[in-house]
């Protein structure tokens, strides 16, 4: 008898090379094989559970950056007046949540912020829990 | 044939709003659906393997905090003279281990330390390994 | 019917007690039960996917340390002029990758660097993905 295989784990790596002041970051998924989807610059959460979250990037100017998952809830990450980020966190997310950026700068210019090595990774830690697609 | 489902992953999120000087923190699990249990202010480890551990909190006074898992072993985390913690770690834990806090303050008062946003998350990383219940 | 078990997750914990200047660190796996293997002071990657990586250690002198996974690619970790490390990261690794250290010191002596509590942990986060053995 063939041993059971794991169904694919919900995970995604998105990249971002620019962020818009007082808006968010333009995220793209470089792989077509991702088990999670991007929609309207947000990562869609289909499965309840803990997620491992990794966020990296170098910015072209000083900015304040927050990563949100639900309206009216506090941010997953919040960094104030930084030119880079390299953070890891764990958070409980649920079906219908959407993970998205908010970015503000102190410059009078409203030009886009350029990002080098911008990467956001989400990995579901509770396969077997509730999912809805 | 129905594809095999994942059995639930061993994981837990506990909250704590107060810690007792020269003792530990009073932990409660907000969800009844957790796959790990709390007993005597300790999280009980049933399954051998690596665990992802996230610890967060803001304290009402400066304290030294350690997170232990086994008598006679070094701590999983150890923070000296802090008013907040936001740490992530990986550790190998085994059946019969118990994860618990030890807290000391430098104040003459022996009152409880109040904690804002106190949260400890453990997530098993090696399903399929040895477990005993 | 017996519920399906998880096949073992690819993971490994290696220890290192010394590093050689302008070379790497001598890594050993304390357990025979590891699901990943060490070869030529490198950890062999058989399975594609995200990996949780934990790196710890205290060094006998100031050094610069990098953790690589593929020739011609940037490091997984890069620390400059440190005497200790306690870092966690997430990276996408693939079959044929090899995880290894590179270390340089600024001392004129070419003696080995002694390491206390040197530990590197890798844990695969995408079981069910492609593996080759």
């Amino acid at each position: 008898q063939v041993p059971p295989q794991y169904p694919p784990i919900q995970s995604i790596r998105v990249q971002f090379t620019r962020c818009e002041n007082e808006k968010g970051c333009i995220i793209t998924s470089p792989s077509k094989d991702e088990t999670m989807k991007v929609q309207d610059n947000s990562i869609i959460i289909n499965c309840d559970g803990f997620y491992l979250i990794s966020l990296k990037g170098y910015f072209s100017e000083e900015l304040s950056l927050s990563l949100y998952y639900r309206k009216g809830r506090g941010p997953l990450f919040s960094l104030s007046k930084v030119t880079s980020v390299d953070s890891i966190g764990v958070a409980y997310l649920a079906f219908k949540d959407k993970v998205y950026f908010n970015v503000t700068t102190h410059s009078t210019s409203y030009k886009d912020i350029q990002v080098n090595g911008g990467e956001l990774i989400l990995i579901h830690q509770n396969p077997g829990g509730f999912c809805a697609y | 044939q129905v594809p095999p489902q994942y059995p639930p992953i061993q994981s837990i999120r506990v909250q704590f709003t107060r810690c007792e000087n020269e003792k530990g923190c009073i932990i409660t699990s907000p969800s009844k659906d957790e796959t790990m249990k709390v007993q005597d202010n300790s999280i009980i480890i049933n399954c051998d393997g690596f665990y992802l551990i996230s610890l967060k909190g803001y304290f009402s006074e400066e304290l030294s905090l350690s997170l232990y898992y086994r008598k006679g072993r070094g701590p999983l985390f150890s923070l000296s003279k802090v008013t907040s913690v936001d740490s992530i770690g990986v550790a190998y834990l085994a059946f019969k281990d118990k994860v618990y806090f030890n807290v000391t303050t430098h104040s003459t008062s022996y009152k409880d330390i109040q904690v804002n946003g106190g949260e400890l998350i453990l997530i098993h990383q090696n399903p399929g390994g040895f477990c005993a219940y | 019917q017996v519920p399906p078990q998880y096949p073992p997750i690819q993971s490994i914990r290696v220890q290192f007690t010394r590093c050689e200047n302008e070379k790497g660190c001598i890594i050993t796996s304390p357990s025979k039960d590891e699901t990943m293997k060490v070869q030529d002071n490198s950890i062999i990657i058989n399975c594609d996917g995200f990996y949780l990586i934990s790196l710890k250690g205290y060094f006998s002198e100031e050094l610069s340390l990098s953790l690589y996974y593929r020739k011609g690619r940037g490091p997984l970790f890069s620390l400059s002029k440190v005497t200790s490390v306690d870092s966690i990261g997430v990276a996408y690794l693939a079959f044929k990758d090899k995880v290894y250290f590179n270390v340089t010191t600024h001392s004129t002596s070419y003696k080995d660097i002694q390491v206390n509590g040197g530990e590197l942990i890798l844990i695969h986060q995408n079981p069910g993905g492609f593996c080759a053995y």
Partner: antibody
């Protein structure tokens, strides 16, 4: 020197909305926990809402929960209080207060007056 | 919910000792904070965690707490100490509770 400057107080009709702001200077805003405390004319202090330094945790006094929202903008070094469904009982001077330790109100602004009346 | 009770007013003769009390069920088991508010001004933290003085607060201010009562003591009250004084604790739900305030008159 630490400074907290509130603004946004006004006369508003019952059922109306108002957003208060508190601009912080002289300290690292990201490291400080923030609260709103109010004082009705001739009355004592009443704590209204709290947000921790990372913005991840908020708490409210029971009488405002569901109507008021506390938030912070790190780029602008500003604390906000969005007040909806206002009633005459919300009439007060609103102070913002900051603390390096979450339980302390170390520094206070001079307050902004909110009057709810028809 | 937790309630802190203060006397509305206390009088003290200049340079005498004033004691302002704050009553609450087992308040001595909680950390108590005291704030001073002079007329037309914002409050100022004068005692934290029962008995600790922030930098810049004169030594004549001291605090203590046990049982059902917390006490703010002003040893050798000055005219400039005339103000409203508020005790405050955090309840078990991390909500701040203020006492009703005591007005200190220096005679």
């Amino acid at each position: 020197e630490v400074q907290l400057v509130e603004s946004g107080g006004d006369l508003v009709r019952p059922g109306g909305s108002l957003r208060l702001s508190c601009v912080a200077s002289g300290f690292t805003f990201t490291n400080y926990h923030m609260s709103w405390v109010r004082q009705a004319p001739g009355k004592g202090l009443q704590w209204v809402a709290f947000i921790n330094s990372g913005g991840s945790s908020t708490t409210y006094t029971d009488v405002v929960r569901g109507r008021f929202t506390i938030s912070r903008d790190y780029a602008k070094n500003t604390l906000y209080l969005q007040m909806n469904s206002l009633t005459a009982e919300d009439t007060a001077v609103y102070y913002c207060a900051s603390g390096a330790i979450w339980t302390h109100f170390d520094h206070w602004g001079q307050g902004t007056l909110v009057t709810v009346s028809s | 919910s937790f309630v802190l009770t203060q006397l509305p007013s206390v009088s003290v003769t200049l340079r005498q000792t004033a004691r302002i009390t704050c009553g609450g069920d087992s308040v001595g088991s909680k950390s108590v904070y005291w704030y001073q508010q002079k007329l037309g001004q914002a409050p100022v933290l004068i005692i934290y965690r029962d008995s600790n003085r922030p930098t810049g607060i004169p030594e004549r201010f001291s605090g203590a707490s046990s049982g059902n009562t917390a006490t703010l003591t002003i040893s050798g009250a000055l005219a400039e100490d005339e103000a409203d004084y508020y005790c405050q604790v955090w309840d078990n739900s991390n909500k701040a509770i203020f006492g009703g305030g005591t007005h200190l008159t220096v005679l």
